[in-house]
Interface confidence: medium
């Protein structure tokens, strides 16, 4: 807390300037109209004032605004953003995309901070869904947006938005999210031709139901196997020999790589030998010859 | 810690162009980077400052038009750069840099220099 | 533009007080910085904003700022802090920064 102390004789200030760098920090809090500052605000980023300095700065601001800042002067926050709690941030109402442009700008190239992870969560519920330009501009700053948001957050972005985002925006998602994701990117890369909508739907498969990946490996997609194993296990399971053949093409060689680890192992499990076999990779751990295989899920269905 | 490290000693003629660099680890919005220089057996000089997150950057009158600072964040280096070298321009030169925010020593930033680099000797000789 | 005045030279008898003196027009209204340089290394800041101390820089370092003249002062002088000491404040029309003009302490 600066005490309060009156502003020497001349150093009012009558406009925001660099010359405010040398005052000391009772004589910002003295000298400098929180009016003035709140007016001026666009002209503070070009200076280099100290944290310090900063810090008087907002506790202006705070006096003056005491129930949230209006969004003329968030836009112009710049660094004294950096400055800012999430609990000064829960008071503000965002609605303009080009301020939270603005306030991202700032804290570019840092993880993302519990104000700016505040200031997207206050701008977002203002919108009602996460938008295409929202999510377009979430993504550039932070790839990992999308994948920290629960399943139910997810559940509001429409289809239309899913086209923003890029393969790495997805690195860090678990099956549930992507569970959410899938039938969007889905709905949304639904006109698309075979292969331009392999290409585009590829990231979201580990959503992918078992009948959409017996469907794709009608379509010769040639499927990685860095893809493939981020299938989910149960809806892999179900596919034959052939088809998890016809889906990962040549690269269906990779699976022996890979046989000690899910879903891989899990399917290995359920095949016959002499199916795996056929594939001539040297796949062990199928069902051997001349045992009968019972899928109980579907005999308790039918009951 | 901070540390600067600026490039080796350079031995120059008149009227050639030189760039010596002050590299840091880390940066902050609120680093910034002076240029002090020291001819032989003087005092300290201010020539100027730069604060790359404010585009800002100031020299001293007497290096106003003599030298050219600059930096690159991305790579959190300062630099000071000289179109004609001149003999008078013979010194050590150091950089200096304060980092804006609560650290190891105290709450203050870059109009206070608490990281200094090594040193670069330029010498300017026919 | 703003100049610093320090006195060339200070002597002092080990375990005594040396106090060093930084003089000019605009002290009162700015910081004042100061740095320690022994022969053959770069400064070293002991004092901040008038009588801050970093950490690291011993206690028998201390500083004040009043009227137009800002003070360093070393009590217990030791050995060690032999060496030139400069102040630095800031000349306001110019927004650079300035250098006092060294002062060389003598630890007799």
């Known amino acids: 807390e600066v005490e309060k102390t009156a502003c020497p004789s001349g150093k009012k200030a009558r406009e925001i300037d660099e010359s405010l760098i040398f005052y000391k920090k009772w004589e910002l809090e003295a000298c400098v109209d929180a009016a003035l500052l709140a007016t001026q605000m666009d002209r503070v980023n070009a200076i280099p004032f100290t944290y310090e300095q900063l810090d008087v700065l907002k506790h202006k601001l705070d006096e003056l605004y005491p129930q949230g800042y209006p969004e003329s002067v968030i836009q112009h926050l710049g660094y004294l953003f950096l400055k800012m709690s999430p609990e000064d941030i829960r008071k503000w109402n965002v609605t303009s995309l080009e301020t939270l442009k603005a306030l991202l700008e700032v804290n570019k190239g840092h993880e993302m901070s519990p104000q700016v992870a505040t200031l997207i969560d206050r701008f977002v519920k203002g919108r009602g869904q996460l938008d295409k330009d929202t999510l377009d501009t979430l993504t550039a700053f932070y790839p990992g947006y999308l994948c920290s948001l629960s399943p139910e957050e997810l559940s509001s972005v429409p289809p239309s938005s899913i086209w923003a985002v890029r393969p790495q925006d997805l690195d860090t998602c678990d099956p549930r999210q992507l569970d959410v994701l899938y039938p969007k990117a889905r709905l949304a890369f639904q006109n698309m031709n075979g292969s331009e909508y392999f290409v585009k739907i590829q990231s979201f498969l580990g959503g992918a139901p078992t009948e959409d990946l017996k469907a794709l490996s009608q379509q010769n997609v040639s499927m990685d196997l860095a893809t493939f194993m981020k299938l989910r296990t149960d809806a892999v399971l179900p596919l034959t020999v052939a088809e998890v053949q016809k889906l990962l093409g040549p690269h269906v060689e990779g699976l022996k790589a890979e046989e000690r680890h899910r879903p891989v192992r899990d399917w290995i499990l359920r095949q016959r030998q002499d199916d795996l076999d056929t594939l001539g990779l040297g796949l062990q751990g199928g069902i051997p010859n001349g045992y009968l295989v019972l899928d109980l899920s579907m005999q308790e269905a039918l009951s | 810690q901070v540390q600067l490290v600026q490039s080796g000693a350079e031995v120059k003629k008149p009227g050639e162009s030189l760039k010596i660099s002050c590299k840091g680890s880390g940066y902050s919005f609120n680093t910034s980077w002076i240029w002090v220089r020291q001819m032989p057996g003087k005092g300290l000089e201010w020539m100027g400052i730069?604060?790359?997150?404010?585009?800002?950057?100031r020299y001293s009158p007497s290096f106003q038009g003599q030298v050219t600072i600059s930096a690159d964040k991305s790579i959190s280096t300062a630099y000071l750069q000289w179109s004609s070298l001149k003999a008078s321009d013979t010194a050590m030169y150091y950089c200096?840099?304060?980092?804006?925010?609560?650290?190891?020593?105290?709450?203050?930033?870059?109009?206070?220099?608490?990281?200094w680099g090594q040193g670069t000797l330029v010498t300017v000789s026919s | 533009d703003i100049e610093l005045t320090q006195p060339p030279s200070v002597s002092v008898a080990p375990g005594q007080t040396a106090r060093i003196s930084c003089s000019g027009d605009?002290?009162?209204?700015?910081?004042v910085h100061w740095y320690q340089q022994k022969p053959g290394q770069a400064p070293v800041l002991v004092i901040y904003e008038d009588s801050d101390r970093p950490s690291g820089i011993p206690e028998r370092f201390s500083g004040s700022n009043s009227g137009n003249t800002a003070t360093l002062t070393i009590s217990g002088t030791q050995a060690e802090d032999e060496a030139d000491y400069y102040c630095?404040?800031?000349?306001?029309?110019?927004?650079?920064?300035?250098f006092g003009g060294g002062t060389k302490l003598t630890v007799l």
């Open positions: 200096a840099r304060g980092d804006g925010g609560p650290s190891s020593q105290g709450n203050y930033f870059g109009w206070v220099y608490d990281v």
């Open positions: 730069i604060h790359p997150g404010h585009s800002y950057t």
């Open positions: 605009n002290i009162p209204n700015f910081y």
């Open positions: 630095q404040s800031y000349d306001k029309p110019t927004f650079s920064g300035v």
